[in-house]
């Protein structure tokens, strides 16, 4: 594809030299490269009051390339833009700016949040959790026999972790007291199967958070399970402060 060209460039650079350095096809002592060897990109770099032509294998940061039939040319992106598709559309902003729909912004618009890793404005993502799984069998110290009052647990999964400004995740574990008909354990039995049992149901769709007490349990000593529950609650309070996802709750 031939281009019809103005001749001004030649007149502006009368001392055109053919013995050029670094990828130049034609050059001048005063202005450096005037044209490049095939496949190289021509860039005008400002040095003081002078503009020097340089030939590069690809456009530098802050420029985008256009492959014309007769010249591969680099054009400057907007001042706040590091990488761009063209003058109108930035694809990566300079440090301290956030990319939003091809523009570089100091702050993200309302309803969006800054992703400090990608330096883009992104939609706020709230936590999403699955439905509760069924309650586990009533157990005590890992057994399903040899007791009357025990605990049962149910869990749910985090389907979508929240972004920085998103709503935190609700608890993903719930434990509550349960009562079963006491059944003697057979020798060596740990009793994996669920039993017929009466349940103390939590309030309509909600569950009271409480540190497990020993009331109604066979031993007044703190069980490992209760210790674990206490630790999990402490952990959760710390996580709440850190604005992290909450994951465990104990209900009686």
């Amino acid at each position: 594809q031939n281009a019809s060209r103005g001749r001004r460039q030649r007149r502006m650079h009368p001392n055109v030299s053919q013995g050029c350095q670094g990828g130049c096809a034609t050059c001048s002592d005063y202005n450096g490269c005037l044209s490049c060897k095939p496949r190289l990109f021509f860039v005008l770099e400002r040095i003081g009051m002078k503009q020097i032509g340089v030939c590069l294998s690809s456009c530098p940061s802050g420029y985008y390339g256009t492959r014309y039939p007769d010249i591969n040319k680099c054009t400057k992106c907007k001042a706040d833009c590091d990488t761009c598709f063209n003058k109108n559309f930035c694809t990566k902003c300079k440090s301290g700016f956030y990319l939003h729909l091809g523009k570089c912004l100091d702050n993200c618009p309302e309803g969006l949040e800054a992703n400090n890793h990608t330096m883009e404005c992104v939609n706020i993502v709230h936590c999403e959790v699955s439905e509760w799984n069924p309650w586990s069998p009533c157990t005590k110290k890992g057994k399903t026999c040899g007791f009357k009052r025990g605990t049962e647990t149910r869990v749910r999964e985090i389907m979508q972790h929240p972004s920085a400004k998103g709503n935190l995740c609700p608890p993903t574990n719930e434990t509550r007291k349960c009562t079963v008909q006491r059944k003697k354990c057979q020798k060596g039995e740990r009793g994996k199967k669920g039993r017929e049992r009466k349940r103390k149901k939590p309030n309509k769709g909600e569950s009271k958070e409480a540190i497990p007490d020993s009331k109604g349990l066979e031993s007044s000593k703190e069980t490992p399970e209760q210790r674990e529950n206490k630790q999990q609650q402490k952990k959760r309070k710390v996580q709440d402060k850190q604005q992290k996802s909450v994951s465990v709750s104990t209900v009686h």
Partner: antibody, heavy 116, light 107 residues
Framework: EVQLVESGGGSVQPGRSLKVSCAAS????????MAWVRQAPKKGLEWVAT????????YYRDSVKGRFTLSRDNTKSTLCLQMDSLRSEDTATYYC?????????WGQGIMVTVSS | DIQMTQSPASLSASLGETVSIECLAS??????LVWYQQKSGKSPQLLIY???RLQDGVPSRFSGSGFGTRFSLKISGMQPEDEADYFC?????????FGAGTKLGLK
Amino acid sequence: EVQLVESGGGSVQPGRSLKVSCAASGFTFSDYDMAWVRQAPKKGLEWVATIIYDGSRTYYRDSVKGRFTLSRDNTKSTLCLQMDSLRSEDTATYYCAAHDRSFDYWGQGIMVTVSS
Amino acid sequence: DIQMTQSPASLSASLGETVSIECLASEDISNDLVWYQQKSGKSPQLLIYAASRLQDGVPSRFSGSGFGTRFSLKISGMQPEDEADYFCQQSYKYLPTFGAGTKLGLK
């Protein structure tokens, strides 16, 4: 608001000439390469020609080379396409567009009919 | 010149349906691909640039993907206002070339 307004279309006989113009506003005209893209009735888009931002270089598709001449006046923010030796296959809606790798801004288009 | 092969030539979709349009380049064009939407009797409008980046004002149900020679435009949940012609264009080098277009209709 960016506006590109084409004018000068119409019906001509094969072999005759026609000049279509485009008046630009709402953006820095002298910063942009400008192009014409055409669309034959019920057909796809076809790039016709581009003139670079300062007017020093023009590029044409093979089928119009030697017949069409593209020029611009940055002081008036106008673009002109002089079409000579028109053929029936030049019948199309001609769009004026700001060309910066993609065609970011488009005019509403002007119909050119070449028919005997 | 780089040839752009677009498919399908036409398709119709029900409201809410997900639609995909493909574009194939005859040589590697990196991510230098643009998608345009042209509604009946109107001029084309830039929809997606750099293969996957949405132009300001374009609904988020539109998305673009691909790199090299294979590209696609997806509409997740067809809306009445999406009824239009869609064109891909390689912006890798001159001459700029377009796909033949896809006419998207509403069932």
